[in-house]
Interface confidence: medium
């Protein structure tokens, strides 16, 4: 979690002198409670916005907006603490609005916004706005919280943000998977414009079950520049295991901008429909011709049980 770096953070508006400060998320009013505290925020709204840094990078940000209740407690409102908690890591970042002048009622409801918390694709956050000072231990709460889910990089606007582009969001491999026979799958996909290797993970499952019965990993070496944006095809050899008929193919690129953390794309082949009168199948079909003197195991992850081509 971080703040967008692009300009001095502003919270002043007509009728209010205000400054934005870093916060430890532990306001002084927790330690030294006050007798009179303001009421809670009203109508807290969190939206996904996009903002550019000074360097021109585009980032998703949480746009936080709330209004004040129209009661006399605004006379005791000294500011607000904005807290963003990333739910999967428990990481928290806070800022504090510090009011340098007293608030007065005016003909419009007071409204505040803040759009400088940078958020990550496909993450969920809890956004809390605390009015300051915070209430005494048994006092009524004066905060409002909302959860906020950031879309992943498949989302049209997210796709062109810097974090998504860095993880390979602009690459559309357009995967097709075709069952050639009971023992072979053909995978076709479009290469990206970078000399980097790819990894294909084949995971097979029994019909209607979620524990895998077979895994095979295949390495595709970095294509040459003339092969960029071309289709590549790989033939994967399947293990002839009972009922292991649903196949998921996942392609992992290793682009320089994201290394091991690039977006992965996958496609699935369902189990074939069972015919009314099953055809007899041969008891055993060899998976490969053993190479003379070869002692390589060819099961879950051997390179030897697949081959690939790039073609224009």
């Amino acid at each position: 979690l971080r703040l967008l770096d692009h300009r001095a953070l502003v919270c002043s508006q007509p009728g209010l002198n205000c400054t934005v400060k870093n916060s430890t998320c532990l306001d002084d009013s927790w330690i030294h409670p006050r007798n009179l505290t303001p009421s809670s925020p009203k109508d807290l709204q969190i939206q996904l916005h996009f903002a550019h840094t000074q360097q021109g990078d585009l980032f998703p940000v949480a746009h936080i907006e709330w209004t004040l209740q129209t009661d006399a407690s605004i006379l005791y409102l000294e500011g607000a603490e904005l807290s963003v908690l990333q739910l999967n890591t428990n990481e928290r970042l806070c800022v504090r609005f510090e009011f340098l002048s007293k608030l007065r009622h005016h003909h419009r409801r007071w409204r505040f916004t803040f759009s400088h918390f940078v958020v990550d694709p496909d993450q969920e956050y809890e956004v809390t706005v605390h009015h300051l000072p915070k209430p005494i231990p048994d006092g009524d709460p004066n905060h409002q919280s909302k959860n906020f889910l950031v879309p992943d990089c498949e989302h049209a606007r997210m796709k062109v943000t810097t974090p998504c582009m860095s993880s390979g969001s602009l690459w559309d491999p357009n995967i097709t998977v075709e069952t050639l026979d009971t023992q072979h799958l053909r995978v076709d996909f479009t290469l990206w414009n970078e000399s980097t290797h790819y990894q294909i993970l084949l995971t097979s499952f029994p019909h209607m079950e979620n524990h895998s019965c077979f895994e095979h990993m295949h390495h595709i070496p970095a294509p040459r520049p003339e092969e960029f944006h071309q289709r590549s095809n790989v033939t994967l050899t399947l293990r002839n295991l009972k009922g292991c008929c649903r196949h998921q193919v996942q392609i992992q690129p290793f682009f320089s901008s994201c290394l091991n953390d690039c977006l992965r794309h996958s496609a699935t082949v369902s189990c074939p429909e069972m015919p009314d009168t099953p055809e007899p199948i041969p008891d055993y079909m060899p998976l490969w011709e053993p190479r003379s003197g070869s002692s390589d195991y060819k099961d879950d992850d051997d390179k030897g049980s697949s081959h690939h081509h790039h073609h224009h």
């Epitope: 993970l201 029994p206 524990h211 019965c213 002839n240 195991y297």
Partner: antibody
């Protein structure tokens, strides 16, 4: 060369848990799954389950489902097998082995004794 | 689950003899079968996979055959270091299962 080095012997009381580690070296850890096999004293081999070091997918023996958890730490190339609610008939040598279907390299084994 | 049955349970033989160990599956396992050798206090050692392919570093005196339900491990001329317990294992279907083992002892 490929090596799987397991943690040392353990003595546990019934109802307790044990966590056995298996540190792999000499190959790319995420390219191969790790299977776990146990052998009670004087008995044969029993397959316990498997974990993919790449995807984290697991497949456990039905009789151990709910009591066993297999995990990996790719940063240290280590696989772990935790068995909970131990009983006296869990006393065995526990082996980790490389691969999913058949096993080309084995750890040296970890003796787990369950006794009150 | 597929039950693997090995016979005999114990075999007493002299060095130099030809040894044939049998493994039977309760249903077809195609050729998805492996053989292991285990000596006291040691981890199993892979000998054969895919019913007939020797694992790395395994001497030519060990050979495997069979498919479907009946499999054989043959040691053409038994050496002193071959006295051990031998296990078969199927990997055609989950759960993976082992045979009960055949102990090859000195006559």
């Amino acid at each position: 060369q490929v090596q799987l080095v397991q943690s040392g012997a353990e003595v546990k009381k019934p109802g307790a848990s044990v966590k056995v580690s298996c540190k792999a070296s000499g190959y790319t850890f995420t390219r191969y799954g790790i299977s776990w096999v146990r052998q009670a004293p004087g008995q044969g081999l029993e397959w316990m389950g498997w974990i993919s070091a790449y995807s984290g997918n697991t497949n456990y023996a039905q009789k151990l489902q709910g009591r066993v958890t297999m995990t990996t730490d790719t940063s240290t190339s280590t696989a772990y097998m935790e068995l909970r609610s131990l009983r006296s008939d869990d006393t065995a040598v526990y082996y980790c082995a490389r691969r999913q279907l058949y096993f080309d390299y084995w750890g040296q084994g970890t003796l787990v004794t369950v006794s009150s | 689950e597929i039950v693997m049955t090995q016979s005999p349970a114990t075999l007493s033989v002299s060095p130099g003899e030809r040894v044939t160990l049998s493994c039977r599956a309760s249903q077809s396992v195609s050729s998805n079968l492996a053989w292991f050798q285990q000596k006291p206090g040691q981890a199993p050692r892979p000998l054969i996979y895919d019913a007939s392919t020797r694992a790395a570093g395994i001497p030519a005196r060990f050979s495997g055959s069979g498919s479907g339900t009946d499999f054989t491990l043959t040691i053409s001329s038994l050496q002193s270091e071959d006295f051990a317990v031998y296990y078969c294992q199927q990997y055609d279907n989950w759960p993976l299962t082992f045979g009960g083992g055949t102990k090859v002892e000195i006559k």
